[in-house]
Structures are given as C-alpha cells and as structure tokens.
C-alpha cells in the first residue's frame, strides 16, 4: 500500500538497517526509496528537546510485515518509502538548505558569486555529491563566498550541523542538469585498473553499468563475464573511482568488459530497470518466498508485486508436474544484487520491475516499428500529438511531443495569432485525423510558454511548451519521448525520423494518416552553405537528403525529429522551417533540443 504522507512526532520502533544524515524528512524519504531494502524511516528534526547530535538523522528501516510499531516522540518524523507506490519517482533535489552545514570530504574549495553558481559547479564536477556555500554575511572574512564541494561514500552527508550564514544543497546530476559527458560505450576485453570502492554480482556488463550509475561513488566499472578464467571472479562487477574521474590504466584482458557511470545520461536511458531474463542462470540470495508460477514472466510479475523482492529465479516445471507450473523463488540481499550467480542449472532469473518507475518513463521500449512505407502504424510514435485549434473551425494546427505527463514540446511559430490557450486542444494516441470526432477526448491547454527570445522561426528560439490542464496517463499509444542529455552533445545520430500529418508537397492539404520519413542529419556547416541568406546557429539542427524528396512540410511544424540511440528514442529536433518542402539541397531546419534542455527543465520543474 502506498502511503505518501509523513507522520509527525512519530517514531518507528526497530527494524533499523542503517543511519544516514539528510537535511529534511522529505529527502530522507527519497533516500529510503532508493535504498535496496528500506521500506520505512524515522527522521529527527532539529528541536530543543532533542540532542543536537541526533538532529537530521535519517534511520532507514525494514520489516517483513512492511510496517513497524509506532511510538510518540517529539521532533521525530516517520514515513514509508515510495517503493510501495506506482507513481514516477525522482532523486532530483533542487532545495537549498539555509543555515545548514552538510559535512563530507571537502575536496574542492573555490570562490563563487552565489549559491546557484556553487550548485552548478557541484553538478558539473564528477565527484561532487553536495556542497556548502558561505554567504557574504558569513562572519569569517576569509571564508565568505567560498564554495566547498563535498563527497562521501554514501552520497549523503556524514553529519549535518546548524551554521549561520551558510547554505547547502545537492548536485543536480539526477535532475539531468549536468554538462558532464555521457559515455555510453562498453569496452570489450578491457580492465580498468583503479581502486575498487565496491563489488557486486551482475549477470552482464549492462546491469553492472546500471549499478555503477546509481552507486554514489562509482565513476566507472569493470565486469568479469562468465567466461572469465578465474572462477571466483566470474560475474563480478567492480565499481571503481579515481582522483581524475577517469581510469588511469586500461589493461587488455579477454572476457572482461569495462565502461563508465551513466550518471550524466540518466534521464535518457534506463538505470534502475533491469528488464532482461537470464536463461540457464540462477541468482542466489536470501529467500523471501517460493511460489508456483506458469512462466518466468509470471514469476517476474510476482517479484515486482512483492515489495521486498529484489530478484528471482524460476525453475520450469518438470513434465506433467504441478499443473505445468514451475517454482518461482523470490529473493533479496543487502545490496539488491545476487550474492552469487550460477550457470548451467536450468533456472531463468531476473530482477523486479518495481524500480523501473525510478527511471524516466521515456526510456520504456516501444513496440517494433514497420520498416519502409510512409504511413505510420498505431503506437509507432506514441509521443506524437496533434495540436488542434478551434478557430475559425476545429483543425490540425501543429505537431508536438509528449515530454512529461503535463507537458507538450512544440514550436513557438505555431502560436502566431493564437489569442488564448483555451482555444487549443491536444489529441494524443491518434493515428488518423479522421478518428477525431466531436466526442473524442482531448487535453485542454492551461498555458502556452514561448521562449522569450523567439521572434521568428528563421532566427531561432522556435520552441514552446504547452502545459496541459490534466495529466496524461501513459499507455502504449501515448507516452513521453526522452530529451537528449546535455552530455550527449557529441553523439552522431544515424536513425532519425520526422513525423507529422503535414502536407506531402508544397500545395497540398493535411494528411489523414500520420506520415513518417527517415531523414539523415546534416552538419551545420553543410546546412549553412544551403542557406546563405540565413544564420544557421548551434541552436538549430538540419536534416534532409541532398537530392531532396523527403522532408517535413506545412502542418508538421512543432512535431518531433526523433532519433533512436542505444535502443532509446530521443527528441533531437522540433520541426521549424525550411525553404519549400523536400527541395534539392534545401534541408529542413529544426530547433536543436539539446541546447534548450535547461530552459525546458526550468519551465517544467518550476514550483
């Protein structure tokens, strides 16, 4: 059962796993949610009745029954983890804590103009977990405006104390605001020879990489595959760090794979969600329950629905045994990973999907698309919406993309002459315009947010957000697309598609069926040559065939240029402008979304 509210002056008795320090009960709840075993917590707020050494303690707790006895205690705040909840969860914490000093290893000290600048510095520093900033009112002159970057083994402070005229806060890496590079490559036959901060068991290098990503101290990893010569090290995932933030030595070793933490690309790839099944593989761990199940998929469902289950092993039924049902072993461990992985015993293993909600919804795999053809099929582009105006009559105005459960990203130029958001209607999950009838449900628009530097499409900043009046329930036919990570600026996308209901030639009409076209990206230098009368800025991105023939056109505006990278679709561009449609040597010009990620997050995450 999902309980989100906090219980004031209440303490949960027993069940302690560990104690950490957090600046608020709200953040204690987040820490509990991300901890592999924590189901409940008790936080101690600052209070004259409480020993100051206990202030800001966050005691993480577990219980077989998923609850613990409650005791009245002043200044104690208790609650439950969000593991029990189905809603989207984020570790992003933008709060600034006034007059609090969050203790950790102070590894970098520099002058900063403001707390915001200090937080940005922390976000863009590979080691930084949190910071403390001495304001200009700080008593000690030599410490004023000093920005201390800090890290700890756990990612949370080792202690928190009251200190006048300082402010503290966390790195915003988990808010997708870091400019650090996102290196997705996994290097085969490579060992990174740096200090290990931890080791866990993992079935493959991808899971190892994801574990590294959400481990606070891990910057890169080495994984020994099941063919690794040393038996005791098979399936071992070594979590590593170094002072420079990069591996100091790479050793060529067969059957080992290495890679980097995906911290800077967390918003556009799954990090917590290990959805694969591992055949002929047994995961060992503490047994939670053994239940009968028809298949390994059913077993995974059982594990997902059991809040304490972290992973499972399914042993298929022997012929005609137990009505064809196999045994489903639900398991857990102290760190969420198997204590040992065995092969050749016939089991099928996997992980709970409960943690998938900690990943961005946009990373969910969508159904395979039909290759070739220009008409789309239902569910092929579930983020694509059709934006209708009711003035003078109801009609398709522009395309748009779902980027959040209340947010559509589109082009600013779509709103020329639109006097009010009330006259707009957003339809999602639509394949054919003819499906839209008077009684078709739609999302009303609460607010149109146009980039304040927008003047006209050709001069850039052609980007707008629509805040919907109600939230979108994600389904197979309507779900968000990932924004590109700022750390992905140098990625070369090779699988890009433009979609929309727009014209198929310059003098035409809106199409009934959603059209799609695969279009190659064109460098900005090349694009500039084709548009000598315009300035193609780095905030624009171009796509098109040299010979023309495939392009976006009137009515496609505001829609997505979607590129698939590492099995995840990213909103790389917003259809903006071009000379004619599909003309030879006249590529389409799109708003370069990666350059607006900060703007998007600022507008969509505003309180």
């Amino acid at each position: 059962e999902c309980v989100t509210q906090l219980l004031k002056d209440t303490c949960f008795e027993g069940g302690d796993i560990t104690t950490v320090f957090t600046p608020s009960a709200k953040y204690c709840q987040v820490v509990c949610t991300y901890h592999p075993r924590c189901l409940l917590f008790t936080f101690t707020a600052e209070s004259p009745s409480e020993d100051p050494t206990r202030w800001f303690t966050c005691v993480l707790k577990d219980s077989v029954t998923e609850t613990l006895p409650r005791v009245n205690r002043t200044a104690a705040i208790s609650g439950y983890s969000f593991k029990q909840c189905s809603h989207q969860i984020s570790a992003c914490n933008k709060d600034i804590y006034v007059d609090l000093d969050m203790k950790g290893i102070n590894y970098n000290s520099s002058v900063a103009k403001s707390a915001q600048e200090c937080q940005e510095r922390c976000t863009d520093d590979v080691h930084c977990h949190f910071f403390t900033y001495a304001t200009r009112q700080f008593p000690s002159l030599e410490h004023r405006n000093i920005c201390l970057l800090k890290h700890t083994q756990t990612g949370t402070p080792t202690r928190i104390t009251k200190l006048d005229k300082v402010v503290s806060g966390f790195s915003l890496k988990s808010c997708a605001l870091s400019n650090l590079a996102c290196i997705r490559d996994i290097f085969p036959n490579t060992v990174f020879a740096d200090s290990n901060i931890d080791s866990v068991m993992a079935p493959d290098a991808f899971v190892c990489g994801r574990i590294c990503t959400h481990h606070p101290g891990c910057l890169f990893f080495t994984f020994f595959s099941q063919e690794w010569p040393k038996e005791s090290q098979r399936n071992l995932c070594l979590l590593k760090t170094s002072e420079s933030g990069l591996p100091s030595t790479r050793i060529k070793k067969s059957k080992a794979l290495s890679g980097f933490s995906l911290q800077s690309c967390r918003h556009s790839i799954p990090v917590f969600c290990h959805s694969s099944f591992y055949h002929d593989t047994d995961f060992l761990g503490e047994e939670l329950d053994i239940v009968a199940a028809k298949s390994h998929e059913a077993c995974q469902k059982l594990c997902t629905n059991a809040v304490r289950c972290q992973f499972f092993t399914y042993t298929p039924a022997q012929a005609s045994c137990n009505e064809g049902k196999g045994k489903c072993y639900l398991k857990l461990s102290s760190n969420g990973s198997p204590t040992k992985i065995l092969h050749g015993r016939g089991g099928i293993s996997g992980y709970t999907l409960r943690l998938c909600k900690m990943d961005n919804e946009c990373t969910t795999k969508i159904k395979p698309r039909i290759v070739g053809g220009t008409a789309s099929v239902r569910g092929e582009w579930p983020w694509q919406v059709t934006l209708h105006t009711t003035s003078p009559t109801q009609r398709h105005l522009c395309g748009g993309s779902i980027i959040g459960n209340q947010w559509i990203l589109t082009a600013a130029h779509c709103f020329y002459g639109v006097e009010s958001p009330k006259i707009l209607r957003v339809y999602s999950g639509i394949l054919n315009q003819s499906e839209i009838k008077e009684d078709t449900s739609f999302f009303g628009v609460q607010e149109i947010i146009i980039h304040d530097q927008y003047k006209m499409a050709e001069s850039g900043y052609d980007i707008a957000l629509l805040k919907l009046e109600t939230t979108v329930n994600y389904t197979d036919s309507q779900r968000p697309i990932c924004l590109p990570s700022k750390g992905d600026r140098n990625v070369i996308y090779t699988d890009c598609w433009v979609t929309g209901w727009g014209y198929r030639k310059l003098r035409d009409k809106i199409q009934n069926t959603l059209q799609k076209a695969k279009i190659p990206l064109v460098t900005n230098e090349e694009c500039q040559k084709r548009y000598r009368g315009h300035k193609i800025t780095h905030k624009m991105i171009c796509a098109g065939y040299r010979e023309g023939g495939k392009d976006a056109c009137k009515g496609d505006s505001g829609g997505p240029l979607s590129c698939k990278h590492n099995e995840v679709w990213h909103l790389v561009g917003i259809t903006s402008w071009g000379e004619g449609c599909a003309q030879r040597e006249r590529p389409g010009v799109y708003t370069n979304v990666v350059e607006y990620v900060d703007w998007i997050l600022e507008k969509t995450q505003a309180v």
Partner: antibody, heavy 117, light 107 residues
Framework: QVQLVQSGSELKKPGASVKLSCKAS????????MHWVKQAPGQGLEWIGN????????NYDEKFRTRATLTADTSTSTAYMELSSLRSEDTAVYYC??????????WGQGTTVTVSS | NIVMTQSPSSLSASVGDRVTITCKAS??????VSWFQQKPGQAPKLLIY???NRYTGVPDRFSGSGSATDFTLTISSLQAEDVADYHC?????????FGQGTKLEIK
C-alpha cells in the same frame, strides 16, 4: 438537445444602441465559439464576429470592429452582441450560431432589428 | 478577405431534376467550405461541412464536392420541399465569408 434562443425584435432610432442576447442550452457553452451573422432584407449572410466564452477571445470583421461588441456570461450561458451608432443599413435579422466541430451547426431563430426615425 | 462567388443567383428546376450550385473561392480554402439551406422566414440550416460531408439528418440526395477554390452542391433528385435559398461559406480564415446565395424554385 442543443438550443439557441434569441431575444425578441427591436425597433431603434438612428444613433442608438441595441444589445441582443442568445441563450444557449444543451451543450458546454464555454467550449464552443459563438458567431454572429447579419442578414439584411433580401440579402445574403454577412459574418460579424465570434467569441470564445471560456476566454473571451473575440474576432471581428473589420466592417463591424468599431461598432459591434461581443460578450458572454458563462454563469447564464448567454452570448450578447451590442451594436452602437445604429443606422438604417443595420436593419436586418441577426443570428447567433454555434461553431460546432467543423461548421456552424446550430442557429438561433434570429432577432429582427429595425432602425427607423 | 476571401470572396466566395456563388452561381447561379437563382435557378428554376423541376421535381426529380439534378441540380448543381457552384461556389468559387478567391483563394485556396482547402476543404473548409459549408453549405446551408434557408427556407423563407427561417434560420439557415447546415447541410454539408468540410466540402463533402453530409450533416446528420440531411437526406442523401444532397452531396458536396470540391477542394481548394471550386466547390459544388448537388441535389441528385429535386423534391418540392427543397425550395429555399442556399448559401456557401468558408471557415478557412478570418473574416468568415459567405456567397451571395442561390434562390432555388420549382418550375
């Protein structure tokens, strides 16, 4: 069922103003544009303007912009058109009509305005 | 402003005749054209929307066709009750405009 009921006939002197009403029922008044159309005796239809009751957004034909004022009262689901500085050529039947999904699908019965000294 | 030119301004036909009324737009209005029927002393009634879609309850002898600038209303077999004025109108862009109307009579 959808109904638009307009106020009764008006006889006005040149230079005066007239305010016509159109009471809507049977649908969500705030979600549809309400248009006003003029039909002079023996003539065709002439568009005056429209209003979106949910936001009070309006559009007018240039010819009527300075003299016609469209308003809506969402509490009573009533649209109004006020026409000022009346002259003899304003003698006509005035219709309110709802812009449905694709077209003007429901019309009021019309209000006759006669301007005569 | 988009001008809608309707022709003929009046026409007389016999019961059972096929009747055609045309409307020409001064610029491309895609298919944002409607046809209305107005009987004496009554308000206009919607017949056709989107150039070719018959409105609910309209007899199937009425049909519409055309796109861009040329539009047609056809009555496949004229009935006595079809005596009325017929108006075309465009809702592609502001200001909305109508044709001058066609008076249809029975011979």
């Amino acid at each position: 069922q959808v109904q638009l009921v307009q106020s009764g006939s008006e006889l006005k002197k040149p230079g005066a103003s007239v305010k016509l009403s159109c009471k809507a029922s049977g649908y969500t008044f705030t979600r549809y544009w309400m248009h006003w159309v003029k039909q002079a005796p023996g003539q065709g239809l002439e568009w005056i303007g429209n209003i979106y009751p949910d936001s009070d957004s309006t559009n007018y034909d240039e010819k009527f912009r300075t003299r016609a004022t469209l308003t809506a009262d969402t509490s009573t689901s009533t649209a109004y058109m006020e026409l000022s500085s009346l002259r003899s050529e304003d003698t006509a039947v005035y219709y309110c009509t709802r812009m449905g999904f694709y077209a003007m699908d429901y019309w009021g019965q019309g209000t006759t305005v006669t301007v005569s000294s | 402003n988009i001008v809608m030119t309707q022709s003929p301004s009046s026409l007389s036909a016999s019961v059972g005749d096929r009747v055609t009324i045309t409307c020409k737009a001064s610029e491309n209005v895609v298919t944002y054209v409607s046809w209305f029927q107005q009987k004496p002393g009554q308000a206009p009634k919607l017949l056709i929307y989107g150039a070719s879609n018959r409105y609910t309850g309209v007899p199937d002898r009425f049909s519409g066709s055309g796109s861009a600038t040329d539009f047609t209303l056809t009555i496949s077999s004229l009935q006595a009750e079809d005596v009325a004025d017929y108006h075309c109108g465009q809702s592609y862009s502001y200001p909305l405009t109508f044709g001058q109307g066609t008076k249809l009579e029975i011979k």
